[in-house]
Every structure is written in structure tokens, then in C-alpha cells.
């Protein structure tokens, strides 16, 4: 086919999709034109496995990513539950436009959020010391609408200060009790989430939370003797 005479703009370079927790953000490097006073604008389109291409606009996906001067498109800007369904196979493409001119489309490799997401650490971690125990409560890295499709489980990495690290899990609950610890000792811990998706037998392991340390309570019988 002869080249399209209107396809004379350079294409956007190095597009990246950021999938962090519930975020879905496409970004790219700007197209720089030395001989134009008008700004270059960009258009983003998406498709699912067997669908046609859709322009990414308010009607189709809830955000406007057509004729934009910004060099990113945040599909989850409206709310964390917005954006593409997390178990869908999504392909994105992007081009630059200037008046009647446009670049070639740059098509990205397909993604599935659950397959490709980077999972952050559990949030809002609270630890309550007990007698020879620590009770740990936290919230999940992000909300999963349908927990029959995918769910989080959790691991606690813990160690007595100066001692050997251990791992406890996997737990389905957002509340974990570390028992059989020594009383009146300092234990350090990190919590880690793991995303399990029922359509795939591959998991996504999350980042570890920051290290935090706590002293278990004294044994009641020991306190009575003092």
C-alpha cells in the first residue's frame, strides 16, 4: 500500500503502561516538532480480545484520552474501580495528531491487569501486642470487586531481634495472630500480599511492608511473681 500522505508526524516514543495496585496509567514521551506553533495532541484507542478498536473517551472508558496534549492517560483517574476490567485482555494503541496530520499508530503488547499488576504492600497495618503474641490487622493493597475471580492472601515475615527470619502464611484473613512468641521480647515483622487469580495458575507477589518492631507483653504469671 502507498504511504499515507497525512501520516507524516513522528510517532510517540516509549509508551509504558503502569499497573500498580488498582492504577492503570498509559504514558509516553512527547513528540517534539521544531517548526510548529500548535501543540501536538494525542489519541488513545483500546480493544478487547475480539472487539473493534474504541477511542478512549468519556463514553467508552470514563476518561477523555483523545485530542489531549498531556503525555499520559490515567484510565483510573475517575475512581479506583474505573478503568479496564481486571480480568480482560486489553490492547492499547496511541498516535500523535496535528491538524490533518497524524503519526502511525504505536500498538502496545496486550495486558491483563491481574496477570501483569505490581502489587503494593498491605496498608494501614496495626499491631496489638499480647502475651507471647502479636495480632496484626491491615487492609488489602486494593479492592477486588469479585473475590470469586481473584483474591489476596497474606504472609508475615517475622523475627526476634537478632534472630532467624520466619515466614507464616498463607492467610486469607486481614487479621493475623502470631502466637507462640516469647513474652517481653522484641519482634520485627513485614507483611506481604499475594494476588491469586482463578483464571491463571500464576500468582503475583506484592511488595513487603516497611519493617516495624513490637515488644510482646510480659507473661501474666511472670508479672505476678514480681
Amino acid at each position: 500500500a502507498p504511504p499515507d500522505p497525512l501520516s507524516q508526524l513522528p510517532a510517540p516514543q516509549h509508551p509504558k503502561i503502569r499497573l500498580y495496585n488498582a492504577e492503570q496509567v498509559l504514558s509516553w514521551e512527547p513528540v517534539a516538532l521544531s517548526n510548529s506553533t500548535r501543540p501536538v495532541v494525542y489519541q488513545v484507542q483500546f480493544k478487547y480480545t475480539d472487539s473493534k478498536w474504541f477511542t478512549a473517551d468519556i463514553m467508552s472508558i470514563g476518561v477523555n484520552c483523545t485530542q489531549i496534549t498531556a503525555t499520559e492517560c490515567d484510565f483510573t483517574a475517575a475512581s479506583p474501580s474505573a478503568g479496564f476490567p481486571m480480568d480482560f485482555n486489553v490492547t492499547l494503541r496511541l498516535r500523535a495528531e496535528l491538524g490533518a496530520l497524524h503519526s502511525a499508530w504505536v500498538t502496545m503488547p496486550w495486558f491483563q491487569h491481574y496477570r501483569n499488576v505490581t502489587v503494593g504492600p498491605p496498608e494501614n497495618i496495626e499491631v496489638t501486642p499480647g502475651e507471647g503474641s502479636l495480632i496484626i490487622r491491615f487492609s488489602s493493597p486494593f479492592d477486588i470487586a469479585d473475590t470469586s475471580t481473584a483474591f489476596f492472601c497474606y504472609y508475615v515475615h517475622y523475627w526476634e531481634k537478632g534472630g532467624i527470619q520466619q515466614v507464616k502464611g498463607p492467610f486469607r484473613s486481614n487479621s493475623i495472630s502470631l502466637d507462640n512468641l516469647k513474652p517481653s521480647r522484641v519482634y520485627c515483622l513485614q507483611v506481604q500480599a499475594q494476588l491469586l487469580w482463578n483464571k491463571s495458575n500464576i500468582f503475583r507477589v506484592g511488595h513487603l511492608s516497611n519493617i516495624s518492631c513490637y515488644e510482646t507483653m510480659a507473661d501474666a504469671s511472670t508479672e505476678l511473681q514480681q
Epitope: Y155, G169, P170, R172, N180, L196, N201
Partner: nanobody, 111 residues
Framework: QVQLQESGGGLVQAGGSLRLSCAAS????????MAWYRQAPGKQRELVAT??????WYADSVEGRFTVSRNNAKNTMYLHMNSLKPEDTAVYYC??????NGQGTQVTVSS
């Protein structure tokens, strides 16, 4: 509390196979939830497989090579490791929420 004990590690050539066992002391213990993880010297602990009965999920690095099975009559969970690679060299541990961890079992894969 139920105690876990790993065994079955050893030295094996690249491409070879091993079967690791995770035995639970305690006649009533059933493995409905458990995981295998590994620790190589100087590296972060790495989750290898997670089991929530009846499903198992695997790390990208071992998917298609490692499988998990269990024998409830023997209170034992297994990690079948095929097509082993030098990068699989580590101490392997099993863990379950209601049990104490074991000492791990060393797997060394030579090239």
C-alpha cells in the same frame, strides 16, 4: 502446635528432578492451605507455590516445572521439581498458617 518438617533435598544435575516432602506432626492436621518458599544465599525469600485446596498457584520462574501434591493419609505435602536449573539452588521451606515452620531442606543444582 503442629510442627512441619521438610526433607528430600540434595545435589542434582541441571535437568534433573527431586521430590521434596513437607510432613506435619499431628494426626489431625490436613493441608488445606500451605505454601512453599525458598531462600538462596544473599537473596530475598521467594514464594514458589501456594496451595488453597483444591487449587495451586505457582511463581513465573517455576510454572510448568514444579507441581504440588498432597497425601492426607500421610499428613504430607510434596513439591515435585522437574527440569531443575542452577538458579533453583536454595533452601526450601514449607509453611502453613496453623503450624510451626521446619528447618528447610537444601537443594543444590549443579551445571
Amino acid at each position: 502446635q503442629v510442627q512441619l518438617q521438610e526433607s528430600g533435598g540434595g545435589l542434582v544435575q541441571a535437568g534433573g528432578s527431586l521430590r521434596l516432602s513437607c510432613a506435619a506432626s499431628g494426626s489431625t492436621f490436613t493441608f488445606s492451605t500451605m505454601a512453599w518458599y525458598r531462600q538462596a544465599p544473599g537473596k530475598q525469600r521467594e514464594l514458589v507455590a501456594t496451595f488453597f485446596s483444591p487449587s495451586t498457584w505457582y511463581a513465573d520462574s517455576v510454572e510448568g516445572r514444579f507441581t504440588v501434591s498432597r497425601n492426607n493419609a500421610k499428613n504430607t505435602m510434596y513439591l515435585h521439581m522437574n527440569s531443575l536449573k542452577p538458579e533453583d539452588t536454595a533452601v526450601y521451606y514449607c509453611t502453613s498458617p496453623s503450624a510451626s515452620n521446619g528447618q528447610g531442606t537444601q537443594v543444590t543444582v549443579s551445571s
